[in-house]
């Protein structure tokens, strides 16, 4: 945030940039948290825009019995690997077809035993405050579906009558990693020393990191005709004086008519 300065007072202003602001010859360049001519004001909202999507990665191992292992399968550029990958991907796309969060599979390693397939199942969902629940549910469905297919699609009398057959006991879920996104934590961190006073409120499922000085939210402080200003001790109302009134009180809701005060004063004389 920047404010331009013209005229003789500019040199003085340069040395007076506050809160880590830097002078660029014309104005104070303020760090993210501040604005104003001297970077003296604290912003009332911080952009913590969430990512559009959140991803999860499940590390799984399955054992394919319908393909004979050869050393060429270790070479990811070999025809054997490419064909195996194509078929395995097709098979997994069928297995997980009912999961909206399913993106695909990525084979990380093939090893002997018939073919032990170490792979990642990739999941993705649109960001909503419930993304953790959505992805947790999706990972459970993945576990159910892979367990089911590796139990059902097995060799019978040395014949595999499916796209692929599996060893029922070779199915394992090693690890589940979900991209972490914690708006409350991000908000606190970005608000730095004002972290105690900034909160996350949701609007249309989007998180907003705001202080009580930001109008229009449930935590917003009503300063009436005054101005809300953030300080290290929290939000405060700076009350104004108009031509006719003085305002006071914690929310500047107490107005005193100047004429009454002046009139009272003159009356004493």
């Amino acid at each position: 945030r920047t404010t331009t300065c013209f005229g003789d007072g500019c040199q003085n202003t340069a040395s007076r940039c506050k809160n880590g602001g830097t002078w660029d010859g014309l104005k104070c360049q303020c760090p993210n948290l501040y604005y104003g001519e001297l970077c003296e004001e604290v912003v009332s909202s911080i952009d913590i825009g969430p990512p559009e999507t959140i991803s999860a990665q499940m590390e799984l191992t399955v054992t394919v019995t319908s393909v004979k292992f050869t050393e060429e399968l270790k070479n990811h550029s070999s025809q054997e690997f490419q064909e195996f990958k194509q078929t395995f991907t097709e098979q997994m796309n069928i297995v997980y077809s009912g999961i909206p969060e399913y993106v695909g599979v990525n084979i990380t390693k093939l090893r002997l035993g018939s073919v032990v397939v170490e792979h990642d199942v990739l999941l993705r969902t649109k960001y909503t405050p419930e993304y953790k629940t959505v992805l947790d549910n999706a990972t459970e469905v993945v576990k159910e579906k892979i367990t089911k297919v590796t139990t059902q699609q097995i060799m019978i009398n040395d014949i595999c009558s499916d796209m692929m057959c599996f060893n029922t006991t070779g199915t394992q879920v090693q690890n589940i990693t979900v991209t972490q996104y914690d708006p409350e934590e991000d908000c606190r961190k970005m608000a730095k020393e004002y972290g105690d006073y900034f909160v996350v409120e949701y609007r249309d499922q989007k998180p907003y990191c705001i202080s009580p000085c930001e109008p229009g939210f449930s935590v917003s402080k009503n300063c009436n005709l005054g101005k809300c200003q953030m300080s290290l001790s929290g939000p405060q109302c700076l009350c104004v004086t108009t031509e006719t009134h003085w305002y006071s009180g914690e929310t500047c809701n107490q107005g005193t008519q100047k004429s009454l005060v002046y009139g009272h004063h003159h009356h004493h004389h």
Partner: nanobody, 124 residues
Framework: EVQLVESGGGLVQPGRSLRLSCAAS???????MGWFRQAPGKEREGVAG???????GYADSVKGRFTISKDNAKNSLYLQMNSLRAEDTALYSC???????????????????RGQGTQVTVSS
């Protein structure tokens, strides 16, 4: 990527024989190979399959009449069709599995490469 080209189809009278060939662009030694057919308005069905070690399997409707074989040296697959019937009329295509596929039979799932097909019409 394996390219498969079928030949040998045509019009034949019931009871007669026909031999279909399928030329593959790559090594078929370590592949399951198969023949499929699709009649107008019907689903595609597996006719015959052969594993890399020569074990064969047939659909019930063609058992005893059709014989599948392969020539690894020529990268070719064959289907000898005897005692042809009107219900054998269909587009016949050959197919190949991924390398090192085991436990094959004549069902469709093993195969990832397929040819365009050759038409067989059995009619008097």
């Amino acid at each position: 990527e394996v390219q498969l080209v079928e030949s040998g189809g045509g019009l034949v009278q019931p009871g007669r024989s026909l031999r279909l060939s399928c030329a593959a662009s790559g090594d078929i030694t370590r592949r399951c190979m198969g023949w499929f057919r699709q009649a107008p308005g019907k689903e595609r069905e597996g006719v015959a399959g052969i594993s890399e070690d020569g074990i064969t399997g047939y659909a019930d409707s063609v058992k005893g009449r059709f014989t599948i074989s392969k020539d690894n040296a020529k990268n070719s697959l064959y289907l000898q069709m005897n005692s042809l019937r009107a219900e054998d009329t269909a587009l016949y295509s050959c197919a190949a599995s991924i390398l090192n596929r085991v436990g094959c039979r004549q069902l469709s799932y093993e195969y990832i490469y397929r040819g365009q097909g050759t038409q067989v019409t059995v009619s008097s």
